[in-house]
Amino acid sequence: LSLEGSRTLTVCPGSVQPLSSQTLRASSSAGTDPQLLLYRVVRGPQLGRLFHAQQDSTGEALVNFTQAEVYAGNILYEHEMPTEPFWEAHDTLELQLSSPPARDVAATLAVAVSFEAACPQRPSHLWKNKGLWVPEGQRAKITMAALDASNLLASVPSPQRLEHDVLFQVTQFPSRGQLLVSEEPLHAGQPHFLQSQLAAGQLVYAHGGGGTQQDGFHFRAHLQGPAGATVAGPQTSEAFAITVRDVNERPPQPQASVPLRITRGSRAPISRAQLSVVDPDSAPGEIEYEVQRAPHNGFLSLVGGGPGPVTHFTQADVDSGRLAFVANGSSVAGVFQLSMSDGASPPLPMSLAVDILPSAIEVQLQAPLEVPQALGRSSLSQQQLRVVSDREEPEAAYRLIQGPKYGHLLVGGRPASAFSQLQIDQGEVVFAFTNFSSSHDHFRVLALARGVNASAVVNITVRALLHVWAGGPWPQGATLRLDPTILDAGELANRTGSVPHFRLLEGPRHGRVVRVPRARTEPGGSQLVEQFTQQDLEDGRLGLEVGRPEGRAPSPTGDSLTLELWAQGVPPAVASLDFATEPYNAARPYSVALLSVPEATRMEAGKPESSTPTGEPGPMASSPVPAVAKGGFLGFLEANMFS
């Protein structure tokens, strides 16, 4: 077993963070299924808790989890906010990884909880920056319940903390009111106030009246040392929001809702994108939602609440990321029917749509891409790439993650590394060879559909432009002529303007391909051939010696030749010539030109002299020659008989 990943987790204060494969990634030399890589929590976290997304609120500490659950993002660390402010805190988890029969591996996961980090769940870097609600034309104290930089002070070691303060410098003043410290207005010449003044209740905002538009101020907060000296340490620039409450109550206005998209069996927070209202005179905690009707694909839950579904929650729960949707195994979309009220206006109906994404998609590869040899290119179709999940995914998009080695993909005639299912279905995605040295290729794509991805490899083969003989059996022990009636790449020759050539890759198991001397005057016997051309076939220079299977009585059998066919300007292609053989039967008409027949047959005919050392054909076999072969075979005899 081996452990990879950073083994460090950075968490925003008070938030939930999933463990990921970047953090914790186990593997085994045996390639064990991630579901069988088991972690045991030896010592749990001190500053929060570890829980499973689907059993989050049981209150029981998580004891075991698998690598597969980490990959799925189901193992969550929740930081629990302490009562005492802090700037940075460190937590550890001690884990034991096991997957018998391998030896256990101990691991420590370090957790850093820091206000330094940029946190989407918590836009402020301060202990508190909650904003202020003030009635129109009135004044309100800004207390430490609304604005508190104690966490900046917490970065200073406690013995020196009393000598330090936090200086707030106002960089943009309120536009509809005034800030006062000890009843003295702040202005460009005196833009500062201190955390200690805030703590003493000396900071006040006075609204100038004339409407309930939002107000606020921007500030920079940093540590101040003894005697007002600036010291190195954490600092932040933020805005403090001031909401002016209308004395005349107005009903909340629901905002347009974006459906929640979630994979089945998982958990996702509900955000303001799904549920939000505009209500200038109600605080988020005053906006209450009630579930009137829930869908069957899951339920709403509150972090820190009970294990079951919640039926009541507030806008503050949504804004803080505490409200989550827990999906069950259903793949059907659903809608929550809700009612919403600020407590002073009649309830308003609202809805929350939940779209269930597939937990996984699959790229279906029904066949390799076959490229016609003379064209050197072919369009992809659904046979090569089609995405399915719990339904077909016509909206799938593909991205090349490893390109083909001997060609490229084109969309609309130009090289492209990304394309859609629609472009495939319309025949716009083409693979074309650019390097004509291989008869096959492959590329890897990443498919993306409904937020989920999967990868697949598309194999490419070249279909030879070759006409191959497909007739009856050939006689064992005979030599037959290999000519265009058996193998013909003439069309490839015409299409490429070149002489195709063949390379013997494999076979036959019983027999061999030989070059036949043109005449008796040519020296030597039959030469073994590994390469030949279309011209050789047309010239009748080649023979196939059909062997007998060794070590058994003569009987019909199958054999084959595997060839690679090359021509100029096109990719090579592999083709095979499959044929059946049988013991030679002198009475049978063979539909191929026989250059020689088995020795025994000649001896029986009383003509031993016909077996020539040059491999020249002996007298015509007693088998009648069919018309198809007569021209070739008799022509061969006539051309050579008197040479």
């Epitope: 290119r377 390109g403 590394s417 490429t496 303007g497 100029q568």
Partner: antibody
């Protein structure tokens, strides 16, 4: 739209290595297909040198293959050309291009 | 390598003329042909890709045709800004190769 900008020394001594970098903006070098280097000798036609693809694979013109290396830095969205053992015959304007769009070209003179 | 031969190597024409430039490949290139325009001291600009597809922003007076080994670039009505050198380039087989160029001059 994709923009390409070549950078590198305009003068290289014979037998040394010519090094140029192409910075791509308006698109990622991991998504465009081919990132090519092409050169043009003074008053002459265009000669393709080689390419690097979105997945980092290379191909070079056989006439220059023994001297050429094209590499990339995805973090900077750049790809580079190195041409070793240069001679006066390598004096040319060097372009980087994805074929749809080309850099403005940089003249490299090989001279002692 | 596939050789690309352009003809003519130069031509003189007047504004408003119809101009045709041909490009012949030493073997079939399956329509994988680009046409570029280059002005002195400037980088080439793509006009046409895949034999006949007009690149974005290119005026419709430019058109391309051809198949197999023979391809043509046509400028239906020559404009003053069209006086330049034109190159064809094949991307059917590696190495990519260019034609030697056709210079279009003012008569």
């Amino acid at each position: 739209q994709v923009q390409l900008q070549e950078s590198g020394p305009g003068l290289v001594k014979p037998s040394q290595t010519l090094s140029l970098t192409c910075t791509v903006s308006g698109g990622s070098i991991t998504s465009g297909y081919y990132w090519n280097w092409i050169r043009q000798h003074p008053g002459k036609g265009l000669e393709w040198i080689g390419y690097i693809t979105y997945d980092g694979s290379n191909n070079y013109n056989p006439s220059l293959k023994s001297r050429v290396t094209i590499s990339r830095d995805t973090s900077k969205n750049q790809f580079s050309l190195k041409l070793s053992s240069v001679t006066a015959a390598d004096t040319a304007v060097y372009y980087c291009a994805d074929f749809d769009y080309w850099g403005q070209g940089t003249l490299v003179t090989v001279s002692s | 390598d596939i050789q690309m031969t352009q003809s003519p190597s130069s031509l003189s024409a007047s504004v408003g003329d119809r101009v045709t430039i041909t490009c012949r490949a030493s073997q079939g290139i399956r329509n994988y042909l680009n046409w570029y325009q280059q002005k002195p001291g400037k980088a080439p600009k793509l006009l046409i890709y895949y034999t006949s597809s007009l690149h974005s922003g290119v005026p419709s007076r430019f058109s391309g045709s051809g198949s197999g080994t023979d391809y043509t670039l046509t400028i239906s009505s020559l404009q003053p800004e069209d006086f330049a050198t034109y190159y064809c380039q094949q991307y059917s087989a590696l190495p990519w190769t260019f034609g030697q160029g056709t210079k279009v001059e003012i008569k």
